[in-house]
């Protein structure tokens, strides 16, 4: 959480921004919020990235204003523009490109003053890991699947009953390029794993980590997955 | 006050080469990227190149990669533009601007020097 003031004195507001993640390929959100005005009128925003020389997107007067935005950003921006009034200045992002990615801005203009905070924006690709038992296996098989990954992660299997045991030796993983040639399949097989227990895959990069959990009984498989995006800070 | 002033336009043979240099003042110039764009009569100014603060990340306009090159001299303040094999439509006033992101920025800040005219002509 990053939160800055402006630096006039008493002209001066909060604003607050959350550092997040992208999915590349898939929309995105740069939260910001500030303290709130009663006049939309009275409201600018503006949001800007280090090293582009255009703005990212400007909405003032309670509509976007958008003749010096910068060509990277052409038709990907918007503003919740009925939450405005409320304080949020939050930024959607279409289609998040790995370019996306760097220090943002995101800086206001109210009648009680004007105020600013830096968020950092990672860009990747993240997915769900689904585990499944591998009956065309010889012997008792796992494998688990998520389809896109950016940058290439690591592969971590653990089980409930063998707590700390190293799974290396007994397990291969691969990556596979997708068609835009960016991000990648991860496949991950796990061999002579035991009945009545319950398997993790666990898939990480710099921005996400995602668990794939199945547990196999003689009557029944159950399986669970969840990700968690990495390093949320808020200014 | 941001003050950017630019040099070495003029009138340049198809094939030839020009410097164009920046003279950047009232900021702290290694804090910041800097950009080079340029715009052509009755058209909006066009991003062409840009150098982080401390000039080891560059990148540039497809239209201008590979014939133009961009460095800076932070002890000097200075930026620079090598413009090799410089063809007609290369023509245009050449602005060199100060990155928006930074502490100081305020809304309507002018980021941008009065450009220099390049002429690319047989």
């Known amino acids: 959480l990053i939160i800055g003031f402006g630096i006039s004195g008493r002209h001066s507001i909060t604003v607050t921004t959350v550092a997040s993640a992208g999915n590349i390929g898939e929309d995105g959100i740069l939260s910001c919020t500030f303290e709130p005005d009663i006049k939309l009128s009275d409201i600018v925003i503006q949001w800007l990235k280090e090293g582009v020389l255009g703005l990212v997107h400007e909405f003032k007067e309670g509509k976007d204003e958008l003749s010096e935005q910068d060509e990277m950003f052409r038709g990907r921006t918007a503003v919740f523009a009925d939450q405005v009034i409320v304080g949020n200045a939050s930024l959607r992002l279409k289609n998040v490109q790995l370019t996306d990615a760097g220090t943002y801005k995101c800086y206001i203009i109210t009648s009680k003053g004007k105020g600013n905070a830096n968020l950092e924006y990672k860009t990747g690709a993240f997915s769900m890991p689904e585990v499944n038992v591998d009956y065309n296996a010889s012997s008792e098989t796992l494998r688990c699947e998520a389809p896109r990954w950016f940058p290439q992660p690591t592969v971590v299997w653990a089980s409930q009953v063998d707590q700390g045991a190293n799974f290396s030796e007994v397990s291969n993983t691969s990556f596979e390029l997708n068609s835009e040639n960016v991000t990648m399949k991860v496949v991950s097989v796990l061999y002579n794993v035991t009945i009545n227990n319950t398997y993790s895959c666990m898939i990480e990069n710099d921005i996400a980590k995602a668990t794939g959990d199945i547990k196999v009984t003689e009557s029944e498989i159950k399986r669970r997955s969840h990700l968690q995006l990495l390093n949320s800070k808020a200014s | 006050e941001v003050q950017l002033v630019e040099s070495g336009g003029g009138l340049v043979q198809p094939g030839g080469s020009l410097r164009l240099s920046c003279a950047a003042s009232?900021?702290?110039?290694?804090?910041?990227?800097m950009h080079w764009a340029r715009q052509v009569p009755g058209k909006g100014r066009v991003w062409i190149s840009r150098i982080s603060g401390d000039g080891r990340s560059t990148s540039y306009a497809d239209s201008v990669k590979g014939r133009f090159t961009i460095s800076r001299d932070n002890a000097k303040n200075m930026v620079y533009l090598q413009m090799n094999n410089l063809r007609a439509e290369d023509t245009a006033v050449y602005y060199c601007?100060?990155?928006?992101?930074?502490?100081?920025?305020?809304?309507?800040?002018?980021?941008w020097g009065q450009g220099t005219t390049v002429t690319v002509s047989s």
């Open positions: 601007a100060r990155d928006r992101f930074g502490d100081d920025y305020y809304y309507g800040m002018n980021v």
């Open positions: 009232g900021f702290a110039f290694s804090n910041y990227w």
